[in-house]
């Protein structure tokens, strides 16, 4: 079989600070040297890109100086996590593998991770 | 909302050259995959080439490989084939068509007609 | 590459029947990398499925597809007169990305 498989975790609880982490694993079925690794955002069926990074196989993962995410890479491994993140953003978030280079191009598209995000409770006025 | 919508197609003889635009709007070009996929006349669809994101990487169907060039300008939100010694089988209605991001050509133009023919 | 055989060529339904058409292809393709498309005479193709049983945006519920490994499905529950077109699959999961040949559905 000629597909690519990307796992990802079901669920991930974003912190209070509104920081979420997940790892997405893919099963290449060629040896590349050039990935790209996509986060997208579904909800209400529409499709939305969060996040995009391209490396080379054994140099680190370099997202937009802009972007709300930041990662790391290890192997067929990519350690994400996105910042910023509010009680409105919760959703779906789908981890979509490219491998770019060398040829043949590979697909995969990862079931996605449900992160739920809980804005904290503002702090009581202090008498103090 | 999206639009594509593609240009430069014409009669032309067996050998020579065309250009082909396809002007995109309504997204940002830079993060989908653009593909070319074309039908002659009466037959089926067959992809001819795709170019992702940044344009460094650029794959072609075996029977254009090496006659036909796809490029991308995105200050001009424009996809372009360059088609080199095109032949009689070359004929076809010419789409350009947006890779969804899950997947799947979301979004096509209303194609531009190529005869080759002497 | 891999190779994709619809079958039938052409199917010949009424309205208000039931079509179902086949895609087989020659090596698995994960379910998420397979598409469906709708073409009516001198139109552009427009996206009914994707990931093998997604609907694209604004295709309505009569159109489903399903199917795994090497045999995938389209199922139109039942036929309207705008239904009546050329449908084609197709694998985005590797390059080269291919096509069907079509199954062209037509009033009986």
């Known amino acids: 079989c000629k597909a690519m498989h990307v796992a990802q975790p079901a669920v991930v609880l974003a912190s209070s600070r509104g920081i979420a982490s997940f790892v997405c694993e893919y099963a290449s079925p060629g040896k590349a040297t050039e990935v790209r690794v996509t986060v997208l955002r579904q909800a209400d069926s529409q499709v939305t890109e969060v996040c995009a990074a391209t490396y080379m196989m054994g140099n680190e993962l370099t997202f937009l100086d802009d972007s709300i995410c930041t990662g790391t890479s290890s192997g067929n491994q990519v350690n994400l996590t996105i910042q910023g993140l509010r009680a409105m953003d919760t959703g779906l978030y789908i981890c979509k593998v490219e491998l770019m280079y060398p040829p043949p191009y590979y697909l995969g598209i990862g079931n996605g991770t449900q992160i739920y995000v809980i804005d904290p409770e503002p702090c009581p006025d202090s008498d103090f | 909302q999206v639009q594509l919508v593609e240009s430069g197609g014409g009669v032309v003889q067996p050998g020579r050259s065309l250009r082909l635009s396809c002007t995109a709007s309504?997204?940002?070009?830079?993060?989908?995959?653009m593909d070319w996929v074309r039908q002659a006349p009466g037959k089926g669809l067959e992809w001819v080439a795709v170019?992702?994101?940044?344009?460094?990487?650029?794959y072609y169907a075996d029977s254009v490989k090496g006659r036909f060039t796809i490029s991308g300008d995105s200050s001009k939100n424009t996809l372009y084939l360059q088609m080199n010694s095109l032949r009689a089988e070359d004929t076809a209605v010419y789409y350009c068509?947006?890779?969804?991001?899950?997947?799947?050509?979301?979004?096509w133009g209303q194609g531009t007609l190529v005869t080759v023919s002497s | 590459e891999i190779v994709l055989t619809q079958s039938p060529g052409t199917l010949s339904l009424s309205p208000g029947e039931r079509a179902t058409l086949s895609c087989r292809a020659s090596?698995?393709?994960?379910?998420?990398?397979l598409a469906w498309y709708q073409q009516k005479p001198g139109q552009a193709p427009r996206l009914l499925i994707y990931g093998a049983s997604s609907r694209a945006t604004g295709i309505p519920d009569r159109f489903s597809g399903s199917g795994s490994g090497t045999d995938f499905t389209l199922t139109i529950s039942r036929l309207e007169p705008e239904d009546f077109a050329v449908y084609y699959c197709?694998?985005?999961?590797?390059?080269?990305?291919?096509f069907g040949h079509g199954t062209k559905v037509d009033i009986k």
């Open positions: 309504g997204f940002t070009f830079s993060s989908y995959g």
């Open positions: 090596q698995s393709v994960s379910s998420s990398y």
């Open positions: 068509a947006r890779g969804g991001l899950l997947g799947g050509f979301d979004y």
């Open positions: 197709q694998q985005y999961g590797t390059s080269p990305f291919t």
């Open positions: 170019i992702w994101y940044d344009g460094r990487n650029k």
